[in-house]
Interface confidence: medium
């Protein structure tokens, strides 16, 4: 059985479309599971992995390796 584009698995009932945009940053493995691109995490691979050591409480990032501080916090790790 040959599955349609973006369909995977037995019965072709698993759907996965690789994407690299606001809504996700992932490839699809041979089973149709999402595999996050480097620097991204989460079930939809849309959460950037911040700079190592970035305070999870006072820092965040839109892009991998970044560390943006909340108002009132500063430093390389927003700590």
């Amino acid at each position: 059985v040959t599955c349609d584009d973006y369909y995977y698995g037995f019965g072709c009932n698993k759907f996965c479309r690789p994407r690299d945009d606001f809504f996700g940053h992932y490839a699809c493995d041979q089973n149709g599971n999402k595999t996050c691109m480097e620097g991204w995490m989460g079930p939809e691979c849309n959460r950037a992995i911040c700079r190592q050591g970035c305070s999870p409480k006072h820092g965040s990032c839109k892009l991998p390796g970044d560390c943006r501080c909340q108002y009132g916090w500063q430093g390389l790790y927003c700590d």
């Epitope: 759907f15 606001f22 989460g42 849309n46 959460r47 839109k62």
Partner: antibody, heavy 119, light 107 residues
Framework: QVQLVQSGAEVKKPGSSVKVSCKAS????????MHWVRQAPGQGLEWMGA????????AYAQKFQGRVTITADKSTSTAYMELSSLRSEDTAVYYC????????????WGQGTLVTVSS | DIQMTQSPSSLSASVGDRVTITCRAS??????LAWYQQKPGKAPKLLIY???TLADAVPSRFSGSGSGTDYTLTISSLQPEDFATYYC?????????FGGGTKLEIK
Amino acid sequence: QVQLVQSGAEVKKPGSSVKVSCKASGYTFTDYEMHWVRQAPGQGLEWMGAIQPGGGGTAYAQKFQGRVTITADKSTSTAYMELSSLRSEDTAVYYCTRRGYDDYPFAYWGQGTLVTVSS
Amino acid sequence: DIQMTQSPSSLSASVGDRVTITCRASGNIHNYLAWYQQKPGKAPKLLIYNAKTLADAVPSRFSGSGSGTDYTLTISSLQPEDFATYYCQHFWSAPWTFGGGTKLEIK
């Protein structure tokens, strides 16, 4: 279970702003973007934009660019949609909505917030 | 931006009828299409995603088909609770636009 609970109805004057909240529960708030969709009385559905609560990245429909601001507070698992320079055509029910676990469509919806713009 | 054209805009049918609603995208959306049902005063409810996959707890009388730019929602045998407004929506690229809706009324 996933729940999205929105703030109550608002009546606003033309030219003013409105800020609608959407409190999420039943999942990890930062794992999924939150979207906003509106529906004018008797009209269809209109996608306005979305936010990635983890990092704060946003995407907006061009129609609303510059007039809508979507934000998120990770500490309270709450998303906000602020619409400025209100006009009568902005009278609508505003919904927050979230995707399902392994697909893109909106499987989870808030109950809707009616915003009435009237002088 | 991809535009979604839904037809018909309204439809009268009877309980037991087979009903078809179509949605045409202005570009290839590669099956990234959903169908929703909405009743007055309620939020939309997801019926079908990825063009043909039934959402949880949706009755099997609902089915979706299509590819490329043309998609169809079929209700094989209308039940009283199916009278509502139906919307398609694409998820290929932002903005994720909806079709104009099809109001399904009792004949």
